[in-house]
């Protein structure tokens, strides 16, 4: 490339690489790379790889526009996942015969273990794997609000698909709300969209780990694919560091 | 400001001002400022000011994140508005006694007059003015699809308000679709959100220019505030210019 | 758009996204990031000429604003437009961590 | 953020948004734009130091990345981050036109 003076492409690349070295450590709030002396031998644990792949898949589907980056968003976010309370739990009993909806409950103490304080949460996604399907359906997501009431969160038009497909809903606000309350069981309802004059109010979508027809409860494989919350949060120690050094340059 | 060499702030400002001179003309695809010899004397017409104010209000509520700007988006967009077909039109007759919804019909020939070709449309917003209200309601917007079917477009949770408030829905895709079809009457339905087990399916929101209780059809004032489409489009002559010069730098 | 599709397949001299793959072990001497082994970081490079609007060929000058100085800057600069995050896996002591780093991959550039 | 709230009320020497009001008649000699009479265009200015990671005071250096070179550029540059459009009214012959110009007002800046 030539401008007024010739650009040394190799120097630019070297400077970019050096800057990335600092950028990664800076985003992780590490003064130096972590030592590998204590790393257990062998491949990465299955669950860690699954979590990494979930995150990578999310990135691939993410819009690539640069978002203005507040200080807290510059830093890396730890990714964890919290599985839905097992279907055998008694909490599901009263939802058995409802045809327009399926229900997913979560233990907020599991969420709090991953995200000790509400402001640390940067994003929470509810992930559901739908089985392949030949029908189109308009579906809605609700949050359990009080004893028997549900608050509308969002909707999706699900088109037919030949392969199982992961659905993702942004539930950051809801999870932050849960973290502000005491521990307990909280939940979501995934429903058919019932319009004011519609007659067919049956949910035709089948969700892995919930839909009774093909539970396939074969331990781990089923476990990996049952609905879960994907959480992105600032680790507590990084947040404390952030808080204590909140001064301007 | 001082870096290695002192920055001449006045020079920077002058260069920025000169660049803006070029930028505005460039965005309007004008080689020079338009002559003012033919401009009618007196203030701007009422309707033009109303349209300008609508656009300015929209900007104020708009997120200020930079959106990646494809070539077509760099250029200025002409703003026009198309009012809803008057409520006295026979097309509204069959919608009179429906309590869960209100209906808004538009003449696509009016839209085509403003936007002669579908690709020229850059954004279309449906604007409704709701009266002040003490109730919270979850509402939905539908597009007329075929004879008696409606396609879901979006929803909004409307909270109580002490003052009349403008609601805005992005209907760009719908209007582009209409432009691709022949002329005729097309419409939207604004409904209460009816959940699968909800009993109260009445729309409590009152919309200026529609809600029968307080029509106040007093010519212009009412006319200004009845539902309309706010259209942003590349003017035809600018688009032709664009098309002919689509080469890379 | 000055994106990977256009820039990687052209010999654009002006502002464009340039290819750069970073191998953590080879380029940074790091073996602590377990996944991925590297990533396409890319970078923006190339001039964004400041356009003097007093140029005699004014209509030609105006056509250049779109690419060279769309933001009407006093000194336009070639910078990232679209960015993507990068998830990584690393260990802290014996504990594996999955973290997401925002704005790590340059997908397109712009004069700003 | 390096936005109007922070930058207009500080004497920041590094990258920041700077105040600039453009009066169409006075600054550009134009009377053809009927509305608005002018607008707060603003602009970005100030250094974004490139940070060498071989600096001995490394932990201090890392803390500066966030502001000075968050995108890990080889030569970071002070550019607009948040922009807003500007609607204008002007005449073409006898016909008034309302048009919206995208990305005209600089609300905040960043090192990129």
């Amino acid at each position: 490339l030539s401008t007024c003076k010739t650009i040394d492409m190799e120097l630019v690349k070297r400077k970019r690489i050096e800057a990335i070295r600092g950028q990664i450590l800076s985003k992780l709030r590490l003064a130096s790379p972590p030592s590998q002396g204590e790393v257990p031998p062998g491949p990465l644990p299955e669950a860690v790889l699954a979590l990494y792949n979930s995150t990578r898949d999310r990135v691939a589907g993410e819009s690539a526009d640069p978002e203005p980056e507040p200080e807290a968003d510059y830093y890396a976010k730890e990714v964890t996942r919290v599985l839905m309370v097992d279907r055998n739990n008694a909490i599901y009993d009263k939802t058995k015969d409802i045809t327009h909806s399926i229900y997913m409950f979560f233990n907020t103490s599991d969420i709090r273990e991953a995200v000790p304080e509400p402001p640390l949460l940067s994003r929470a996604e509810l992930r559901l794997q739908r089985f392949k399907s030949t029908v189109e359906q308009h579906v809605e997501l609700y949050q359990k609000y009080s004893n028997n009431s549900w608050r509308y969160l969002g909707n999706r038009l699900l088109t037919p698909t030949d392969t199982p497909e992961w659905l993702s809903f942004d539930v950051t606000g809801v999870v932050r709300q849960w973290l502000n309350q005491g521990d307990g069981i909280q939940g979501f309802r995934f429903s058919a969209h019932c319009s004011c004059d519609s007659k067919d109010n049956v949910l035709h979508v089948e969700i892995n780990g919930i839909s009774p027809k093909r539970r396939g409860d074969l331990g781990t494989i089923h476990d990996m694919n049952r609905p879960f919350l994907l959480l992105m949060a600032t680790p507590l120690e990084r947040a404390q560091h952030l808080h204590s050094s909140r001064h301007r340059r | 400001l001082s870096t290695c060499k002192t920055i001449d702030m006045e020079l920077v400002k002058r260069k920025r001002i000169e660049a803006i001179r070029g930028q505005i003309l460039s965005k309007l695809r004008l080689a020079s400022p338009p002559s003012q010899g033919e401009v009618p004397p007196g203030p701007l017409p009422e309707a033009v000011l109303a349209l300008y104010n609508s656009t300015r209000d929209r900007v104020a509520g708009e997120s200020a994140d930079p959106e990646p700007e494809p070539e077509a988006d760099y250029y200025a967009k002409e703003v026009t508005r198309v009012l809803m077909v008057d409520r006295n039109n026979a097309i509204y007759d069959k919608t009179k006694d429906i309590t869960h919804s209100i209906y808004m019909f538009f003449n696509t020939s009016d839209i085509r007059e403003a936007v002669p070709e579908p690709p020229l449309l850059s954004r279309a917003e449906l604007r409704l003015q709701r009266f002040k209200s003490t109730v919270e309601q979850h509402v939905e917007l539908y597009q007329k699809y075929s004879n008696n079917s409606w396609r879901y477009l979006g929803n909004r949770l409307l909270t109580p308000t002490d003052t009349p408030e403008w609601l805005s829905f992005d209907v760009t895709g719908v209007v582009r679709q209409w432009l691709n079809q022949g002329d005729g009457i097309q419409g939207f339905r604004f409904s209460a959100h009816c959940s699968c087990d909800s009993k109260d399916n009445v729309l409590h929101v009152e919309i200026n220019g529609i809600s029968p209780k307080r029509r106040g059809d007093l010519g212009t004032i009412h006319d200004m505030n009845r539902p309309f489409l706010l259209l942003m489009a590349t003017p035809l002559e600018r688009a032709q210019h664009l098309h002919s010069s689509r080469h890379r730098r | 758009a000055l994106d990977t599709n256009y820039c990687f397949s052209s010999t654009e001299k002006n502002c464009c996204v340039r290819q750069l793959y970073i191998d953590f072990r080879k380029d940074l001497g790091w073996k602590w990031i377990h996944e991925p082994k590297g990533y396409h970081a890319n970078f923006c490079l190339g001039p964004c000429p400041y356009i003097w609007s007093l140029d005699t060929q004014y209509s030609k000058v105006l056509a250049l604003y779109n690419q060279h100085n769309p933001g009407a800057s006093a000194s336009p600069c070639c910078v990232p437009q679209a960015l993507e995050p990068l998830p990584i896996v690393y260990y802290v002591g014996r504990k594996p961590k999955v973290e997401q780093l925002s704005n790590m991959i340059v997908r397109s550039c712009k004069c700003s | 953020a390096l936005d109007t709230n922070y930058c207009f009320s500080s004497t920041e020497k590094n990258c920041c948004v700077r105040q600039l009001y453009i009066d169409f008649r006075k600054d550009l000699g134009w009377k053809w734009i009927h509305e608005p009479k002018g607008y707060h265009a603003n602009f970005c200015l100030g250094p974004c130091p490139y940070i060498w990671s071989l600096d001995t005071q490394y932990s201090k250096v890392l803390a500066l990345y966030n502001q000075h070179n968050p995108g890990a550029s080889a030569s970071p540059c002070c550019v607009p981050q948040a922009l807003e459009p500007l609607p204008i009214v002007y005449y073409v012959g006898r016909k008034p036109k309302v048009e919206q110009l995208s990305n005209m007002i600089v609300r905040s800046c960043k090192c990129s």
Partner: antibody
Framework: EVQLVQSGAEVKKPGASVKVSCKAS????????MHWVRQAPGQGLEWMGR????????KYAQKFQGRATLTVDTSTSTAYMELSRLRSDDTAVYYC???????????WGQGTLVTVSS | DIQMTQSPSSLSASVGDRVTITCRAS??????LNWYQQKPGKAVKLLIY???RLHSGVPSRFSGSGSGTDYTLTISSLQPEDFATYFC?????????FGQGTKLEIK
């Protein structure tokens, strides 16, 4: 201020055991692993082992496996190192040191001299 | 275990001198090399970690460099308080191992 304060000097007979304490202050005790390092008179430093106060996970250098026992009391932010079956060549200054995940010891105790003599 | 060989084992120098101590590892330790200062009756102090990073509060006359198996600690201009024993330590692979020390004395 981050500090590690160790117990006082000990004199022990061969075959006996010694338990050295290390009280941490100025930081969250469970957030950092505690390591133990010793230094025989006129010699270099020798790593003995470490404990994770949060999980209780322990790792010993092979040489001290079976003879050293590391424990913590999180309620008092104190780490302990017990060495049994003492021999005269165990005479040394014993240090506790806070480990940073970067692979270095950023804070050290002042040391505890243990003398093994009959 | 990785062997750490430090040299010299002792050295005499004067205030204002530039001093260099080296440390060689028996295998590549990928920059996980740290330097400590020890004074009689005082707690050991971390000076430099990860080859060249200065620990907070350490004067900038101390610097580190190196890669692979060979590393260096440099004191650019000796001060009276710098006379002490210096140790290197590798943080790459368990068990953590130290050099045998370099005693820096006043000439």
């Amino acid at each position: 201020e981050v500090q590690l304060v160790q117990s006082g000097a000990e004199v022990k007979k061969p075959g006996a055991s010694v338990k050295v304490s290390c009280k941490a202050s100025g930081y969250t005790f469970t957030s950092y692993w505690m390591h133990w390092v010793r230094q025989a008179p006129g010699q270099g430093l020798e790593w003995m082992g470490r404990i994770d106060p949060q999980s209780g996970g322990i790792k010993y250098a092979q040489k001290f496996q079976g003879r050293a026992t590391l424990t913590v009391d999180t309620s008092t932010s104190t780490a302990y190192m017990e060495l049994s079956r003492l021999r005269s060549d165990d005479t040394a200054v014993y240090y506790c040191a806070r480990w940073d995940y970067g692979g270095y010891f950023d804070v050290w105790g002042q040391g505890t001299l243990v003398t093994v003599s009959s | 275990d990785i062997q750490m060989t430090q040299s010299p084992s002792s050295l005499s120098a004067s205030v204002g001198d530039r001093v260099t101590i080296t440390c060689r590892a028996s295998q590549d330790i990928t920059n996980y090399l740290n330097w400590y200062q020890q004074k009689p009756g005082k707690a050991v102090k971390l000076l430099i970690y990860y080859t060249s990073r200065l620990h907070s509060g350490v004067p900038s006359r101390f610097s580190g460099s190196g890669s692979g198996t060979d590393y260096t600690l440099t004191i650019s201009s000796l001060q009276p308080e710098d006379f002490a024993t210096y140790f290197c330590q590798q943080g790459d692979t368990l068990p953590w191992t130290f050099g045998q020390g370099t005693k820096l004395e006043i000439k």
